[in-house]
Interface confidence: medium
């Protein structure tokens, strides 16, 4: 069976301040079992933006019903964008375990923030 891929189709997304940004992410397989997390930045200093399993992310909503067992779309919408939200966002698949371990990352989507139109 072909190994799971994490696909972030948009290399970059530009959003006006105050609007919502949609960051697309799909996976190509249901295996291995485990959650998706979104991060801003890469490496040890990356920042957790959304965790499918737990956490408090009031500005982040999932575009599809990500809790459904057969779901393969893990796109998110971030509301009320500000300049501080600019950066590269990575959709990361984890393998279920104790603790969950990182399995594969998407290529990243760069979010740029435009000034609010006057």
């Amino acid at each position: 069976e072909e190994e799971l891929q994490v696909i972030q189709p948009d290399k970059s997304v530009s959003v006006a301040a105050g609007e919502s940004a949609i960051l697309h992410c799909t996976v190509t397989s249901l295996i291995p079992v485990g959650p998706i997390q979104w991060f801003r930045g890469a490496g040890p200093a990356r920042e957790l933006i959304y965790n499918q399993k737990e956490g408090h992310f009031p500005r982040v909503t999932t575009v599809s019903e990500s809790t459904k067992r057969e779901n393969m779309d893990f796109s998110i919408s971030i509301s009320n964008i500000t300049p501080a939200d600019a950066g590269t966002y990575y959709c990361v698949k984890f393998r279920k375990g104790s603790p969950d371990t990182e399995f594969k990352s998407g290529a990243g989507t760069e979010l740029s923030v435009r000034a609010k139109p006057s």
Epitope: G41, E47, L48, G55, H56, F57, T82, P83
Partner: antibody
Framework: DVQLVESGGGVVRPGESLRLSCAAS????????MNWVRQAPGEGLEWVSR????????DYADSVKGRFTISRDNSKNTLYLQMNSLRAEDTAVYYC????????????WGLGAPVTVSS | ETVLTQSPATLSVSPGERATLSCRAS??????LAWHQQKPGQAPRLLIY???NRATGIPDRFSGSGSGTDFTLTISSLQTEDSAVYYC??????????FGGGTKVEIK
């Protein structure tokens, strides 16, 4: 009820080190970004440092960069601030503050830990 | 960096009267502005977030307004327990998170 209790403050000489702790309870500590904010005697509030919920992302005010290190132990629900090479101008009450969201306001504050740097 | 300027530095108001505090940002911060209250010898407490939303448990005599660069905190009928320093905080650009210099509200 959300509770943030700082400890570890005290009186030190310039150049010495101190580690502050902030014990958190009443909320899912591991889900929230946390901050340190300080207030010098008779002065306003100055943001010092921030750490994201997982502990990977950190930010510092220019005035403490390279001297202070923020960290957290999510298994102990505790936030830390390691302060090295302390200076007289670091004298302040240090507050830990919970962040509502990863890019948002501070919704709860601790009671504060006084730090005095004096020769 | 965004600078927040609060005015006046001190405000002296009689009980029952209205107190109006101003916070001006050097560049737009959208609606990403909070107000914190700090009573003498106490830690700060969140009053208002996103410019106009009252935090949990905050009496409705406190209200916030404004967007962009000009913001106002209004205490509609001042109570003696409202004697405190009030700070605005922006979270539109960071780091660093910035606070205003504070407005001290005194009871006449």
């Amino acid at each position: 009820d959300v509770q943030l209790v700082e400890s570890g403050g005290g009186v030190v000489r310039p150049g010495e080190s101190l580690r502050l702790s902030c014990a958190a309870s009443g909320f899912s500590f591991r889900s929230y970004a946390m901050n340190w904010v300080r207030q010098a005697p008779g002065e306003g509030l100055e943001w010092v440092s921030r750490i994201d919920s997982g502990g990977g992302g950190t930010d510092y005010a220019d005035s403490v960069k390279g001297r202070f290190t923020i960290s957290r132990d999510n298994s102990k629900n505790t936030l830390y601030l390691q302060m090295n090479s302390l200076r007289a101008e670091d004298t302040a009450v240090y507050y830990c503050a919970k962040q509502y969201d990863w890019n948002s306001f501070f919704d709860y504050w601790g009671l504060g830990a006084p730090v005095t740097v004096s020769s | 960096e965004t600078v927040l300027t609060q005015s006046p530095a001190t405000l002296s108001v009689s009980p029952g009267e209205r107190a109006t505090l101003s916070c001006r940002a050097s560049q737009t911060v959208g609606s990403k502005l909070a107000w914190h209250q700090q009573k003498p010898g106490q830690a700060p407490r969140l009053l208002i977030y996103d410019a106009s939303n009252r935090a949990t448990g905050i009496p409705d005599r406190f209200s916030g307004s404004g967007s962009g660069t000009d913001f106002t905190l209004t205490i509609s009928s001042l109570q003696t327990e409202d004697s405190a320093v009030y700070y605005c905080q922006q979270y539109y650009y960071w780091p660093p998170y910035r606070f205003g210099g504070g407005t001290k509200v005194e009871i006449k």
